[in-house]
């Protein structure tokens, strides 16, 4: 078992003439989403196999609205890695396709509009347990650029997630601090612990302590972005040596719409009109709709039949997501008590218990006094299942083993100076106050104040 | 239980090298990162730079670059910083520090050795 | 280079008071801030890291607070035992950068 884990660091038009200004156009702010699905294999055939190795879908990115005359930045994205865990061993060679979906938040009837807008598929060598590997790929008019990596989740390791790990003593090849796996000593206990605090997204290491950046990023903890050149060119090919781009050809100069699709110029950019079919600002991608098979573990397709029509899934119990990717984390409610590990096993959720708690939910606390020290004269009590120290006077604490400085809470009022006593505390009170605790002033008939400290007092800290 | 010990105070003179050490006792020292602090007084706490005693790795502030040179010896625990063509300048008391397991910042300090640069 | 203020530079405070201690940086460092305690004859203590988190073993009566660019470090209930000189430095960039301390006198 493990978990591929997908890290996408920029969207956006790609280099070149009539690259798109905006995923948007003219059709008011929308918000792009991510959708990943994986397939085992190389062989040609696996292209139009379903995402067997599993598929995740990331969050909504922040809203997009275009803005008129500015340059075509990278979009906004949704945050955090898209993480697709799988159950059985990983396969070594697979295809990775990511998809990157639009959602239009403009007056739209029957709410948002979903549309594909770029697919990239590519198939993959990849070891688990390896560094992040980086990509950029191209997709018509859009460029993504990611980074990827699989990851075996303990006790499983190896490059294929296949070998369980029982730490052996004998020394090993595994490098500092690591120590090899039954039953081939070739295997390591864990990937290494990379410097604390470095950036999970970011950042990665091949030895303990390291934290080595991936591409942009920089810092001890890879979490400062590299500064990029500000480039006020809109598009075109690059023809100075800052690396900026200067305006090129107009929009739809070549017709940049495929598989039949009329080009129409927006300004700053271009629309294509696509055939029925085909999606994408360059018409160069096929629309899901249910035939695809996007609704993962036994979700109910709806809708969808027109490539025009976005579909919803209807997911099973204990799954939920767009695409019924996600199964619904019941642990994450926390129901085990006491420090226990919550374990769901799909039928039903377990508590493993902590030492000295049981029941269902580890409700009960099993401890009693008879193993209870209640330290310096403490008296232990029971009561519903739970045990305390009564502490004697002086001492606190959970077992009374810390000393307790009766004057510590300042409990004189009006300046009043505060004295520790065997049996307590007493306060001297500033002239024109009395009281256990200084805290009634002085009535105009002439009460007269506590003495200064009665003698066999030991004298604490005034307070101020 | 983690320890960081320094070597002694050191009395060099102008244009002398000196090789500072830093033992480390108490965990794993490939995979904790050394940091070299400098501290003169009127000037606060300066980073000079870090290294990793498992790779080899460092990193330094362009500042001590040419100055500083940070070396480890794993089999000893010893991390070592060397500081060339010394001036008076020099002169202050260095730390060593661990970057912590767990910890995003440094949760062990050595000592700290005295260096005096004088004719 | 993240330049770092701190302020002030002095302060002199009695038992049982709660003192402040800032720390401002030139540009963000999201959270990435640490705090030490300097004493003669001791070596540094580290007292909070990533601007907020207690490390442990030190006393309740130290917090920290901030992120970006300002920071800030609470002593509530001063004892004898915390007049010392504190640093901040900032672990977001390298150079890493301390800022110029804090000496806490008694009053």
């Known amino acids: 078992a493990g978990v591929f884990e997908l890290q996408i660091h920029s969207f956006g038009p790609g280099p070149g003439p009539g690259a798109p200004r905006s995923p948007c156009s003219a059709r008011g702010p929308c918000r792009l989403f991510f959708r990943v699905c994986l397939k085992p294999g190389l062989s040609e055939e696996a292209a139009e196999s379903p995402c067997a190795l599993g598929a995740a879908l990331s969050a909504r990115g922040p809203v997009y609205t275009e803005q008129p005359e500015a340059p075509a930045p990278d979009l906004p994205l949704p945050n955090g890695l898209l993480q697709v865990p799988f159950r059985d061993a990983w396969p070594g060679t697979f295809s990775l396709i990511i998809e990157t979906w639009r959602e239009e938040l403009g007056d739209q009837i029957g709410g948002p509009a979903w549309s594909l807008l770029a697919r990239v598929t590519r198939r993959r060598r990849l070891a688990a347990g390896g560094p992040w590997a980086r990509d950029i790929q191209r997709a018509g008019a859009w460029e993504l650029r990611f980074s990827y990596r699989a990851r075996c989740e303990l006790p499983a390791v190896g490059t294929a997630c296949t070998r369980l790990c029982r730490p052996r003593s004998a020394p090993s090849r595994c490098g500092p601090g690591l120590r090899p796996c039954a039953p081939l000593e070739d295997e390591c206990e864990a990937p290494p612990v990379c410097r604390a605090g470095c950036s999970l997204e970011h950042g990665f290491c091949e030895q303990p302590g390291e934290c080595r950046c991936l591409e942009g990023w920089t810092g001890p903890l890879c979490m400062v972005p590299v500064s990029t050149s500000s480039c006020l060119g809109l598009r075109g090919p690059s023809s100075t040596t800052t690396g900026c781009l200067v305006p090129g050809p107009g929009p739809c100069d070549g017709n940049p719409c495929a598989n039949g699709g009329s080009c129409s110029e927006t300004p700053g950019s271009f629309e294509c009109t696509c055939p029925r079919g085909f999606y994408g600002l360059r018409c160069e991608v096929s629309g899901v709709t249910c035939a695809d098979g996007p609704c993962f573990n036994g979700g109910l397709c709806v809708g969808g039949a027109d490539p025009d029509s976005a579909y919803i899934c209807h997911c099973p119990p204990g799954f939920q997501g767009s695409n019924c990717e996600k199964r619904v984390d019941r642990c994450s409610l926390q129901p085990c008590r006491n420090g226990g590990l919550c374990l769901d096993l799909g039928h039903a959720l377990r508590c493993r218990c902590r030492a000295g708690f049981a029941g269902p939910r580890c409700e009960h606390d099993l401890d009693d006094c008879a193993g209870r020290a209640c330290a310096n004269g403490g008296t232990c009590v029971e009561g519903g299942g739970a045990h305390r120290c009564s502490c004697a006077l002086g001492f606190g604490g959970r077992n009374c083993r810390e000393r307790a400085d009766p004057c510590a809470a300042r409990p004189c009022a009006h300046g009043g100076r505060c004295y520790a006593h065997f049996s307590g505390l007493v306060c001297a009170c500033a002239p024109g106050y009395m009281g256990a605790r200084c805290e009634f002033p002085v009535h105009p008939d002439g009460v007269s104040a506590l003495p200064a400290a009665p003698p066999g007092l030991r004298p604490g800290d005034p307070q101020r | 239980q983690v320890q960081l010990q320094q070597s002694g105070t050191e009395l060099m003179k102008p244009g002398a090298s000196v090789k500072l050490s830093c033992k480390a006792t108490?965990?794993?020292?490939?995979?904790?990162?050394i940091e070299w602090v400098k501290q003169r007084p009127g000037h606060g706490l300066e980073w000079i730079g870090e290294?990793?005693?498992?790779?080899?790795?460092?990193q330094y502030n362009e500042k001590f670059k040419g100055k500083a040179t940070f070396t480890a010896d794993p089999s000893s625990n010893t991390a070592y910083m060397q500081l060339s063509s010394l001036t008076t300048e020099d002169s202050a008391i260095y730390y060593c520090?661990?970057?912590?397991?767990?910890?995003?910042?440094?949760?062990?300090w050595g000592q700290g050795t005295t260096l005096t640069v004088s004719s | 280079d993240v330049q770092i203020t701190q302020s002030p530079s002095y302060l002199a405070a009695s038992p049982g008071e709660t003192i402040t201690i800032n720390c401002r940086a030139s540009?963000?460092?999201?959270?990435?801030l640490a705090w030490y305690q300097e004493k003669p004859g001791k070596t540094n203590k580290l007292l909070i890291y990533?601007?907020?988190t207690l490390h442990s073993g030190i006393p309740s009566r130290f917090s920290g607070s901030g992120s970006g660019t300002d920071f800030t470090l609470t002593i509530s209930s001063l004892e004898p035992e915390d007049f010392a000189i504190y640093y901040c430095?900032?672990?977001?960039?390298?150079?890493?950068?301390f800022g110029g301390g804090t000496k806490l006198e008694l009053k």
């Open positions: 520090a661990r970057w912590g397991s767990t910890v995003v910042a440094y949760d062990y």
């Open positions: 108490g965990y794993t020292f490939t995979g904790n990162w």
């Open positions: 290294i990793l005693p498992g790779t080899g790795s460092t």
């Open positions: 540009k963000s460092i999201s959270k990435y």
């Open positions: 990533s601007g907020s």
């Open positions: 430095q900032q672990h977001n960039e390298y150079p890493l950068t």
